[in-house]
């Protein structure tokens, strides 16, 4: 098998994955444009594996190779960024593992997020040695073209020195770059010779030039930013969740629903109930009761879990996690089975895939 490698990114915590309103954070894998990458589906006992990207079936092509539990992408581009999933189909059930692929050096200009080496870029000169501006770290400036998924943070750096200490200003497409030129403005960290733009949008595309100058001279360097838009999709719900559960009368149970969404999702927990001994109304529709909905007093994390305390026989039945956004609706359902309490003991039997 050809050896491709993809490093799982555990250091870029401040960098949000491209999915803007993702409630559950899947693992994020990062690769630079042009690299080949490989991801292994982290599911056990996978007889048949199918792959999706942003909810759409992913098949092999001239750049995508699917071999067993491995997904290989040759010559990655920012358009390969997105929410991926591998589903293992077994005889009895199926399980899905989600992960993000981010094809970009999202912190740009070869820098890491926390600027730990920033002090080294701020070079102090002997006051007698007058000197025109010069670049102190050209390695961090080699990559001129930056293709970044929308909603990511971009940082351009121009580490420089000189005496007296040069000043830095930024141009966009050759003109002075003003705060009001973009929603949310931008940050300039003079100490680190950097320009930072958060949550980039397509209108941020263009050429960004740093101009570093003092009384003895001026130098400049231009970066090109391309913002790659991800196509939005209706909410994606993690397969296998919520999971069927069983408990005894008086026990507690919880259902978990993990939602991935580009647009702000609305989430509700719905119970299929009976009225006058019937599950269906005169119109043939099931009777539904909204148990929990995202609102002013409910956080995203809270809405993901439906807790049922001190369960009674009436709680048995079908529970649905319903998620909708401006694009569409998705839902997953699970069943709660309520068993009689054995004697005075209260026992809970629930599969570990939904209890945290």
């Amino acid at each position: 098998r050809p050896s491709f490698s993809l490093v799982e990114d555990t250091t870029l915590e401040p960098e949000e994955p491209p999915t803007k309103y993702q409630i559950s954070q899947p693992e994020v894998y990062v690769a630079a444009p042009g690299e080949s990458l490989e991801v292994r589906c982290l599911l056990k006992d996978a007889a048949v594996i199918s792959w999706t990207k942003d909810g759409v079936h992913l098949g092999p092509n001239n750049r995508t190779v699917l071999i067993g539990e491995y997904l290989q992408i040759k010559g990655a581009t920012p358009r390969d960024s997105g929410l991926y999933a591998c589903t293992a189909s077994r005889t009895v059930d199926s399980e899905t593992w989600y992960f993000m692929v981010n094809v970009t050096d999202a912190i740009s200009s070869g820098d890491d997020e926390d600027d730990t080496d920033g002090a080294e870029d701020f070079v102090s000169e002997n006051s007698n040695n007058k000197r025109a501006p010069y670049w102190t770290n050209t390695e961090k400036m080699e990559k001129r073209l930056h293709a970044v998924p929308a909603a990511n943070t971009v940082k351009f750096r121009c580490p420089a020195g000189g005496n007296p200490m040069p000043t830095m200003r930024w141009l966009k497409n050759g003109k002075e770059f003003k705060q009001e030129h973009r929603i949310g403005g931008y940050k300039v960290r003079n100490q680190h010779w950097s320009l930072i733009m958060e949550s980039v949008v397509p209108s941020d595309k263009g050429n960004y030039t740093c101009v570093v100058e003092n009384e003895y001279g001026s130098i400049n360097h231009t970066y090109h930013l391309d913002v790659v838009e991800r196509s939005p999709h209706r909410p994606i719900l993690q397969a296998g969740l919520p999971a069927n559960a069983s408990t005894v009368v008086g026990g507690d149970v919880e259902f978990v629903c993990k939602v991935y969404s580009d647009a702000q999702p609305h989430i509700q927990w719905i119970k299929h109930v009976e009225k006058n001994g019937s599950k269906y109304g005169p119109d043939g529709l099931p009777y539904l009761k909204v148990l929990k909905a995202a609102g002013v007093n409910t956080t995203d994390k809270e809405i993901e879990v439906l807790y049922i305390r001190n369960v009674t026989f009436e709680d048995a039945g079908e529970y649905t996690c319903l998620a909708g956004n401006s694009i569409g609706i998705s839902f997953h359902s699970a069943w709660l089975t309520v068993l009689p309490a054995p004697g005075r003991e209260k026992e809970i039997t629930a599969s570990p895939d939904y209890l945290e």
Partner: antibody, heavy 120, light 110 residues
Framework: QVQLVQSGAEVKKPGSSVKVSCKAS????????ISWVRQAPGQGLEWMGR????????NYAQKFQGRVTITADESTSTAYMELNSLRSEDTAVYYC?????????????WGQGTMVTVSS | QSVLTQPPSASGTPGQRVTISCSGS????????VNWYQQLPGTAPKLLIY???QRPSGVPDRFSGSKSGTSASLAISGLQSEDEADYYC???????????FGGGTKLTVL
């Protein structure tokens, strides 16, 4: 048995707007979505968008984005579809249909249709 | 041009079995379930099959649906004269973010 009853036929001039109503009688209104589908004379079906009263949000087909507005009044169990900047090719029968999310976006009950003619 | 592809016409004699195909792509049929509608002349469409192969109550078991990969098909066994109608397949499309229909198949009972 639930029924979707639509407003009557309309004749409109190019550039104007039309608003078609769809009233649900005899059943639950807010639990499911109401979709709008149109059919030009002798042509196939075309989905325009839907309103999801349970969330208070609407989804629109890309083709109609910005030109169509779908709303709902839960107190009267009525959905509305307004189409702006009408042109002759908008001449069609406009149907509302109950959109069952639990049946993977199947339209299980349809209105009788409203004929909209756009002519100068 | 419809997103889902159906043959424009199909025909059969009473009692025969007829199959109507519906071809799509990975973003619609490949990723989502298929619904089938019957439209009798001059009437509104009627749901025939939902979620690939489920029949709503009131639909005869002569109608059945199936799906494989990016294609789906509707089978009508024991063809009857009242089955003469237009048949449409439909599915959600993850790329277009909406419901897409086939162009329709006109079924003639000879």
């Amino acid at each position: 048995q639930v029924q979707l009853v639509q407003s009557g036929a309309e004749v409109k001039k190019p550039g104007s707007s039309v608003k078609v109503s769809c009233k649900a009688s005899g059943g639950t209104f807010s639990s499911y979505a109401i979709s709008w589908v149109r059919q030009a004379p002798g042509q196939g079906l075309e989905w325009m968008g839907r309103i999801i009263p349970i969330f208070g949000t609407a989804n629109y087909a890309q083709k109609f984005q910005g030109r169509v507005t779908i709303t709902a009044d839960e107190s009267t169990s009525t959905a509305y579809m307004e189409l702006n900047s009408l042109r002759s090719e908008d001449t069609a029968v406009y149907y509302c249909a109950r959109d069952r999310w639990d049946w993977n976006d199947a339209f299980d009950i349809w209105g009788q249709g409203t004929m909209v003619t756009v002519s100068s | 041009q419809s997103v889902l592809t159906q043959p424009p016409s199909a025909s059969g004699t009473p009692g025969q079995r007829v199959t109507i195909s519906c071809s799509g792509s990975s973003s619609n049929i490949g990723s989502n379930t298929v619904n089938w509608y019957q439209q009798l002349p001059g009437t509104a469409p009627k749901l025939l099959i939902y979620s690939n192969n489920q029949r709503p109550s009131g639909v005869p078991d002569r109608f059945s649906g199936s799906k494989s990969g990016t294609s789906a098909s509707l089978a009508i066994s024991g063809l009857q004269s009242e089955d003469e109608a237009d048949y449409y397949c439909a599915a959600w499309d993850d790329s277009l973010n909406g419901v897409v229909f086939g162009g329709g198949t006109k079924l003639t009972v000879l």
